[in-house]
């Protein structure tokens, strides 16, 4: 048994990428455990991550039910073992999270350039349509299926030998860029959610370069 009182969770933070959504909080528990509840503004409080000593809880299964809803979570603190609770009788300690709307707030993951080909004066670049954890009829939806025309990509490109950059935007997953024949180009892509005011761009993809010539040594 002990006399260390339970403390309420704090610094509740949503971490979400491509709808994979985890709630994190502090402190690391000492003589206490946590249970998380999640709710929509008008819905039920549903318990998850029961009696855990973790300081994170994967809430993906709940938020993917409707990514356009706004969610609120709360973290309950319960005494472990024979430890006294600071909550008044029958009142468990808990702390509320900030509100979270997945459609508006989930981070878009780093895009992957699936394929590219340069023929003559055209460079065609295709960005992979990544799967999310959102399901419909038992199958996982892609980013495009979730966001529709709200999702676009920005391609930033340059001649291999130059520092001058150009950009091109598409509402699809493909770019068709006018380039100079026989010149190598380097480029990267970024996803963009047009309807968002903040957090609207993804990280940049890994930069890829076309190979229009080989060195004399054949390297």
């Amino acid at each position: 048994s002990g006399t260390t009182n339970t403390v309420a969770a704090y610094n509740l933070t949503w971490k979400s990428t491509n709808f994979k959504t985890i709630l994190e909080w502090e402190p690391k528990p000492v003589n206490q455990v946590y249970t998380v509840q999640i709710s929509t503004k008008s819905g039920d409080w549903k318990s998850k991550c029961f009696y855990t000593t973790d300081t994170e809880c994967d809430l993906t299964d709940e938020i993917v039910k409707d990514v356009k809803q706004t969610y609120l979570a709360r973290v309950f603190s319960y005494p472990a073992g024979n430890v006294e609770s600071t909550g008044s009788a029958g009142e468990p300690l808990y702390e509320n999270s900030p509100e979270f709307t997945p459609y508006l707030e989930t981070n878009i993951g780093q895009p992957v350039i699936q394929k590219y080909e340069q023929g003559g004066t055209k460079l065609k670049v295709t960005v992979k349509d990544s799967f999310t954890l959102v399901r419909k009829n038992g199958t996982f939806l892609t980013l495009r299926q979730v966001f529709g025309n709200d999702l676009g990509y920005i391609l930033t490109y340059r001649k291999d030998s130059s520092t001058g950059r150009k950009t091109n935007t598409t509402h699809t997953n493909e770019f068709l860029i006018d380039v100079e024949k026989g010149v190598s180009y380097c480029f990267f892509a970024q996803a963009v959610i047009f309807s968002r005011k903040t957090n609207h761009k993804s990280p940049e993809s890994i930069t890829k370069c076309t190979e229009q010539w080989k060195s004399v040594l054949g390297e």
Epitope: V33, T35, Q37, D44, W45, K46, S47, K48, C49, F50, Y51, T52, T53, D54, D58, F76, Y78, A80, G81, P92
Partner: antibody, heavy 121, light 107 residues
């Protein structure tokens, strides 16, 4: 097959303590919480608390706080429930029940056969 | 603590009858409710979890549903082997709590 086997019946005097064991087999012991539920003669079911076998963390119903101690021995896949300062109203059948994990529903899908504890002077 | 009010406390029905038991939670518990069957002298057995999901191996005559804080457990066609006491249990809030039980007998 998956089963929970509990220790035999006990008769105790008021003020004494009792320790009931529950041996798990047929599944990975550390992956499921274990609960203790009691049932006084002719009465309903009452949840006492939970132990996470993987870390030994326990949470008790407030009613039993300070009187109950749940422990586990991972080497034998056994959980124990000790109840102290016994009184006549603690006379009951005590069940261990396997119940979910931190991410699963807390439904008691496997039960021990029960241990009758009689408190009498 | 969440109170689970189960009704009726006992009932008597004929073989083949449809039997309905209700459980009302004192506050919203989402669908975090399970149903158990306990035969005399035996440990309880899980029948329904998460309000409406049938546990593996449980006959399909048993079912569960939810409407707000009201939960219903149904035996579509009562069989002699269904003589038992049935309990609901919520797990949405600490501590976990059970209903008072419904004793089902055959007429």
């Amino acid at each position: 097959q998956v089963q929970l086997v509990q220790s035999g019946a006990e008769v105790k005097k008021p003020g004494a303590s009792v320790k009931v064991s529950c041996k798990a087999s047929g599944y990975t012991f550390a992956n499921y919480y274990m609960h203790w539920v009691r049932q006084a003669p002719g009465q309903g079911l009452e949840w006492m608390g939970i132990i996470n076998p993987s870390g030994g963390i326990t949470v008790y119903a407030q009613k039993f706080q300070g009187r109950v101690t749940m422990t586990r021995d991972t080497s034998t896949s056994t959980v124990y429930m000790e109840l102290s300062s016994l009184r006549s109203e603690d006379t009951a059948v005590y069940y261990c029940a396997r119940g979910g994990s931190k991410v699963a529903a807390l439904a008691f899908d496997i039960w021990g056969q029960g241990t009758m504890v009689t408190v009498s002077s | 603590d969440i109170q689970m009010t189960q009704s009726p406390s006992s009932l008597s029905a004929s073989v083949g009858d449809r039997v309905t038991i209700t459980c009302q939670a004192s506050q919203d518990i989402s669908n975090s409710l399970n149903w158990y069957q306990q035969k005399p002298g035996k440990a309880p057995k899980l029948l329904i979890y998460d309000a409406s999901n049938l546990e593996t191996g449980v006959p399909s005559r048993f079912s569960g549903s939810r409407s707000g804080t009201d939960f219903t457990f149904t035996i579509s066609s009562l069989q002699p082997e269904d003589i038992a006491t049935y309990y609901c249990q919520q797990y949405n809030f600490h501590p976990l709590t059970f209903g008072g039980g419904t004793k089902v007998e055959i007429k």
